[in-house]
Interface confidence: low
């Protein structure tokens, strides 16, 4: 039988590059088989994880998944960096993986970001 | 060169247990997500099962859920798929596939497919 | 689960004529999710075109992908004898992998 713990399924080490201005959904991929568990957000602050609990956020169901999405309405600069989500489960804390956003800020963006590949492992943000 | 040779079909009566193996070279495993894709008799692609490099995530498909478990062992290089409860319409030549994707850095994530695939083993569920 | 339809089920085509392939998926799909496949009999898929458009390595270029969100096409500029197969679309999704039927090509 499949296993019922909630599951957070961020991948390790990745990442979006974003563009200041635009709007942009950050999701955290969650499975559960109940009740549904309360999911937050927060953003890394060196050795710290800061709760963003002023910022929008919502649910999206589909059939063998759902997200808890992160609003950027628009993205700003300063919201470059690392985002790590957490669910409350049966009195346990399950935290996903970081995932980092390199907000570049169009005013000084010279040009388009290089499509060349960045990574040399084949690291997906999310199934 | 980069290879992977499926083992472990045959046949087997309606309700009993395979497993198959994948083993990998010419690559480095560990860096790669795996798929156990499957093909019945004079039929289409489906696609059964995936696990994540690391072994931290797997999917199946709803036809083998439940009853099929994927699972793989980086150090021999060697992915597995254990089959339980096996049905008739189980059988078919199963293949097992290493599925690469690339991070972008113009916020693009490319997928880049199922890129290497091994010859398949039969599998055969009768009574 | 998105749902992807190839059409025609068969194509009959002579060498040296234009292969039009289509693939078209129940919603919306990332066009940097789709693949396409050929397949030969009794050998495994052989990776064609990633991204909707972009040839994988060793792939000739005669053989060119388009379209985005639900409508998606494999083509085949000039067939070769050796492009008679079977040929497949893939999407990638965030649980579950989907394939087309197949669109069999063949001699006419």
């Known amino acids: 039988k499949e296993s019922c713990d909630v599951q957070l399924y961020i991948k390790r080490q990745s990442e979006h590059s974003i563009l200041a201005g635009d709007p942009f959904e950050l999701e955290c991929p969650v499975k559960y088989c109940a009740n549904r568990p309360h999911v937050t957000w927060c953003k890394l602050n060196g050795t710290t994880c800061v709760k963003l609990e002023d910022r929008q956020t919502s649910w999206k169901e589909e059939k063998n998944i759902s997200f808890f999405i992160l609003h950027f309405e628009p993205v700003l600069p300063n919201d470059n960096g690392s985002y790590r989500c957490s669910a409350n489960f049966q009195s346990n804390l399950i935290e996903s993986h970081s995932t980092t956003l390199y907000v570049t800020d169009v005013k000084s963006a010279s040009e388009r970001p290089s499509k060349d590949e960045m990574a040399s492992r084949p690291w997906l943000l999310y199934r | 060169q980069v290879q992977l040779v499926e083992s472990g079909g045959g046949v087997v009566q309606p309700g009993r247990s395979l497993r198959l193996s994948c083993e990998a070279s010419?690559?480095?495993?560990?860096?790669?997500?795996m798929n156990w894709v499957r093909q019945a008799p004079g039929k289409g692609l489906e696609w059964v099962a995936v696990?994540?490099?690391?072994?931290?995530?797997?999917y199946f498909a709803d036809s083998v859920k439940g009853r099929f478990t994927i699972s793989r062992d980086n150090s021999k290089n060697t992915l597995y798929l254990q089959m339980n409860s096996l049905r008739a319409e189980d059988t078919a030549v199963y293949y097992c596939?290493?599925?690469?994707?690339?991070?972008?850095?113009?916020?693009?994530?490319?997928?880049?497919?199922?890129?290497?695939w091994g010859q398949g083993t039969t599998v055969t569920v009768s009574s | 689960e998105i749902v992807l339809t190839q059409f025609p089920g068969t194509l009959s085509l002579s060498p040296g004529e234009r292969a039009t392939l289509s693939c078209r998926a129940s919603q919306s799909v990332s066009s940097s999710y789709l693949a396409w496949y050929q397949q030969k009999p009794g050998q495994a898929p052989r990776l064609l075109i990633y991204g909707a458009s972009s040839r994988a390595t060793g792939i000739p270029d005669r053989f060119s992908g388009s379209g985005s969100g639900t409508d998606f096409t494999l083509t085949i500029s000039r067939l070769e004898p050796e492009d008679f197969a079977v040929y497949y679309c893939?999407?990638?999704?965030?649980?579950?992998?989907?394939f087309g039927q197949g669109t069999r090509l063949e001699i006419k």
């Open positions: 696990i994540w490099n690391d072994g931290s995530n797997k």
């Open positions: 596939a290493r599925e690469v994707f690339t991070m972008v850095r113009g916020i693009i994530i490319t997928y880049y497919g199922m890129d290497v």
């Open positions: 893939q999407q990638y999704g965030r649980s579950i992998i989907t």
């Open positions: 010419g690559f480095t495993f560990n860096n790669y997500d």
